[in-house]
Interface confidence: low
């Protein structure tokens, strides 16, 4: 899906009002320094691409995020504010229904949600720079802290 046509300000509002709080709730009890951010994004469409992937694509050790409150609200925000997004997600919805119903919060899931928090913060104010470039005066570290 091409996220360049989304209404970023509306999605940002949804994040600030509810999604961010749900992410914090999910991470409650986890030390803010426990996980390092390894997933990055440089523009808001790119951030949404990464957010969608981490939120809805099952990964090894963490298959249950799609049923979490923050995921459902993320899905709703994308469906409402990204034209044509819903149509592309029919197969993904079927896969989500087949996911196991029990909510098991594994360490892998906590790490994944920690990455999501970082991506959402970058979506909120994108870094606007490619990662790993040594030719420029960049210091990304301050953007990698967790705020819980």
């Amino acid at each position: 899906y091409d996220f360049t046509n989304c209404d970023f300000e509306k999605i940002k509002a949804a994040y600030l009002s509810t999604i961010s709080k749900d992410l914090i709730t999910y991470m409650s009890g986890t030390k803010s320094t426990e996980f390092n951010n390894t997933v990055s994004c440089s523009n808001r469409p790119h951030c949404l691409t990464e957010i969608q992937s981490l939120t809805f694509n099952p990964t090894a050790g963490c298959a249950s995020l799609a049923k979490e409150m923050f995921a459902m609200k993320t899905k709703a925000a994308l469906a409402i504010w990204c034209p044509g997004y819903s149509e592309t997600q029919i197969n993904a919805t079927q896969a989500m229904k087949k996911a196991r119903k029990s909510k098991v919060t594994t360490n892998k899931c906590l790490e994944q949600v920690s990455q999501l928090q970082g991506l959402w913060r970058r979506f909120n104010r994108p870094l606007l720079k490619q990662q790993g470039s040594s030719d420029y005066k960049d210091d990304d570290d301050k953007h990698h802290h967790h705020h819980h």
């Epitope: 360049t4 523009n43 994108p126 606007l128």
Partner: antibody, heavy 117, light 107 residues
């Protein structure tokens, strides 16, 4: 409405440092990055670098690392670019422009710098 | 660094004609490309961003498109106020780079 008001034209001697200002109004200054772009007479546009007004983090291309210094004054919502030891090669129009996703939706009116002895 | 090759460098056309300006990126920049118009002695003005999204207030005779690493700006039914210089710019990441520009003149 959003405005980026730049300082007026400047005539400087070679070697004398010069500072160009860009006063922002009509939006939250710290939400957008401020970029600087150079345009020599009759030439195209050249990206110099950018500054994040919220924490003054800067990114400059190699060519301008020893030439340009970018700063901001949050209290007055003003961005500055200082050019050190200017030569005739630095004679150009300099623009500030704001961005969130990398494209420039608002530009300053430009500051013409003339370096001449 | 990503290089942006813009063509043609100059173009003569008459009011009412349709013109297309192209820009090729040296590597994949997806849809991260903007187009600007600049009149003599004035600041550039944003026309298109994300390759095909029209900026606020830009007439619908302007349109952007993308095919791989080639980007196009099409101006239908040229108006007198459309003459000037046009620049493409990638906004995929640092360093931002611009195309060399296209000067659109009245025939």
């Amino acid at each position: 409405q959003v405005q980026l008001q730049q300082s007026g034209p400047q005539l400087v001697r070679p070697g004398a440092s010069v500072k160009i200002s860009c006063k922002a109004s009509g939006y939250s200054f710290t939400t957008y990055w401020m970029h600087w772009v150079k345009q020599r007479p009759g030439q195209g546009l050249e990206w110099i670098g950018m500054i994040d007004p919220s924490d003054s983090e800067t990114t400059l291309i190699q060519k301008f690392k020893d030439k340009a210094t970018l700063t901001v004054d949050k209290s007055s919502s003003t961005a500055y670019m200082q050019l050190s030891s200017p030569t005739s090669e630095d004679s150009a129009v300099y623009y500030c422009a704001r961005t969130l996703d990398g494209y420039y939706d608002y530009w300053g009116q430009g500051t013409t710098l003339t370096v001449s002895s | 660094d990503i290089q942006m090759t813009q063509s043609p460098a100059s173009l003569s056309a008459s009011v009412g004609e349709t013109v297309t300006i192209t820009c090729r990126a040296s590597e994949n920049i997806y849809s991260y490309l903007a187009w600007y118009q600049q009149k003599q002695g004035k600041s550039p003005q944003l026309l298109v961003y994300f390759a095909k999204t029209l900026a606020e207030g830009v007439p619908s005779r302007f349109s952007g498109s993308v095919s791989g690493t080639q980007f196009s700006l099409k101006i239908n039914s040229l108006q007198p106020e459309d003459f000037g210089s046009y620049y493409c710019q990638h906004h995929y990441g640092t360093p931002w780079t611009f195309g060399g520009g296209t000067k659109l003149e009245i025939k």
